[in-house]
Interface confidence: medium
């Protein structure tokens, strides 16, 4: 066995093992997505998190899982069976993924102001229509999760929520905000978190009430809601995690480049090995 053959053999099994790992990972992601879709309540109790945007994540996880499994399967079978067409397809898929990421990166860096404004518009629309439309629960859950995780409330200010007519205080009643705005660590008073499910929400039936984010909390006189708007919160989060984000993106990009290089190298050199082997037969 020549050095080239052993090198190709090493690449072949390296690609197979790594893609097998990604196939298993993809199937796990897919299973989680399906689990959330089928049984949300058991997943929430398993994860133990409040305000998880399950509706979006179930679909995102399921699609990502299938996509990861698909690419990994191409790499696995293509490498193990030494099938040029599958390895070529594997390379093509990775190239497409890599090109998409590069394009996204360029778009994000050049169109930052427009993206920020688009995000603000989406958030404003979500806030304005909060709790009134059963079809909008995915966006609402996601925004609740952002508020909960970033410890912020509203876009510019918590008062953004007071623009929503169904959340406005009436007479002696306090204004209301989603419970994801509450700073649970700032208060020991459990009465503050007595939920106020609005009549408008109750008309939506179990669909609205079953999800955590439809819970509306009254703002007490000395409020325990997050004081910071999420625009500042997001900026802080991006600033604090910029190195990590760039690192992960670079890591994923380099990993893709590595697999692309190996797959195309294996694909191009399979012919030479077959030709050499044919002479010995």
């Amino acid at each position: 066995m020549s050095a080239q053959e052993s090198c190709l053999s090493l690449i072949k099994y390296f690609l197979f093992v790594f893609n097998l790992f990604f196939f298993v990972l993809g199937s796990l992601i897919f299973c989680f997505g399906i689990w959330i879709l089928i049984d949300k309540t058991s997943f929430v109790s398993f994860v133990g998190l409040a305000f998880v945007p399950l509706q979006i994540w179930s679909k995102v996880l399921a699609i990502s899982g299938i996509f990861t499994m698909g690419i990994a399967l191409l790499g696995c079978v293509g490498a193990l069976k030494e099938l040029r067409c599958l390895l070529g397809l594997y390379f093509g898929m990775l190239l497409l993924l890599f090109a998409t990421q590069i394009t996204l990166g360029i778009l994000i860096s050049t169109q930052r102001a427009q993206l920020e404004r688009s995000l603000r518009d989406v958030v404003e629309k979500t806030i304005q229509k909060y709790g009134t439309n059963p079809e909008e629960t995915a966006a609402e859950e996601s925004w609740d999760y952002v508020q909960f995780q970033l410890r912020c409330c509203g876009w510019h200010y918590p008062q953004d929520w007071f623009q929503v007519l169904i959340l406005r205080g009436n007479g002696s009643e306090a204004h209301r905000v989603p419970c994801s705005c509450y700073n649970l660590s700032a208060t020991n008073d459990s009465t503050i978190l007595d939920k106020v499910i609005l009549p408008q929400l109750s008309r939506l039936g179990h669909l609205a009430r079953s999800r955590h984010s439809a819970d509306i909390c009254a703002v007490p006189a000395e409020s325990h809601i997050y004081r910071e708007g999420c625009a500042q919160g997001l900026q802080k989060w991006l600033h604090n995690n910029l190195i990590s984000i760039v690192g992960i993106c670079l890591g994923v990009g380099l990993l893709e480049l590595g697999f692309m290089t190996l797959s195309i190298f294996l694909c191009r050199n399979l012919d030479h090995v077959y030709n050499r082997l044919a002479r010995y037969r």
């Epitope: 102001a113 920020e116 404004r117 603000r120 404003e124 876009w155 510019h156 200010y157 008062q159 953004d160 007071f162 623009q163 007519l165 406005r168 205080g169 306090a174 204004h175 625009a231």
Partner: antibody
């Protein structure tokens, strides 16, 4: 920190126009609307209109419509208010103030620009 | 246009006094009311928005309440720096309108 710095005092003749500027700093200029408010001596505050610096959309008080024009220069983070066909009752202090949305409070104000209409 | 009528137009008070300023709208403005403080030669300063929410950095002695057409600004214990003119404003519908102001003077 957030700052709104307005141009200096102006003395103009009746029938002429005046353009007051308001330079914003310490925040993302396109993220907040810019209001213009008039305060004539001994009078209540009067809302003139506002601009959304992101797209240039304007909303005016009908009372000033046709005479007031609000514009912006995003590259300079500056909003402008031009008032034409000036008359003596336009003698006032003009304030710019930022607001996150149209229907919202004005959380930061400029120092004001005194415009005196006198022949 | 929605008219905002403030009362009283002027008021004399002493340091430590509890002061209440009222603002009546000509129609329901659904808590879309702000309160501003203005000192001579200075720009107005936001105190309260959405009828009852204190703006960042505003002392807790200032409080707002009300709904429908009637709104109040209360200063629980007057301080020397609180002597100024106070304005209410509705941002429920355009044109946004201000009250005529309440001038707080030292007794």
């Amino acid at each position: 920190q957030v700052q709104l710095v307005q141009s200096g005092a102006e003395v103009v003749k009746p029938g002429a126009s005046v353009k007051v500027s308001c330079k914003a700093s310490g925040y993302s200029f396109t993220d907040y609307n810019m209001y213009w408010v008039k305060q004539a001596p001994g009078q209540r505050l009067e809302w003139m209109g506002y601009i959304d610096p992101y797209n240039g959309d304007t909303t005016y008080n009908q009372k000033f419509k046709g005479r007031v024009t609000i514009t912006r220069d995003t590259s300079a983070s500056t909003a402008y208010m031009e008032l034409s066909s000036l008359r003596s009752e336009d003698t006032a202090v003009y304030y710019c103030a930022r607001s996150p949305y149209g229907h919202y409070a004005m959380d930061y104000w400029g120092q004001g620009t005194l415009v005196t209409v006198s022949s | 246009d929605i008219q905002m009528t403030q009362s009283p137009s002027s008021l004399s008070a002493s340091v430590g006094d509890r002061v209440t300023i009222t603002c009546k709208a000509s129609q329901d403005v659904s808590t879309a009311v702000d309160w501003y403080q203005q000192k001579p030669g200075k720009a107005p300063k936001l105190l309260i928005n959405w009828a009852s929410t204190r703006h960042t950095g505003v002392p807790s002695r200032f409080s707002g309440s009300g709904s429908g057409t009637d709104y109040t600004l209360t200063i629980s214990s007057m301080q020397p720096e609180d002597f100024a003119t106070y304005y209410c404003r509705q941002h429920y519908s355009t044109p946004f309108t201000f009250g005529q102001g309440t001038k707080l003077e030292i007794k």
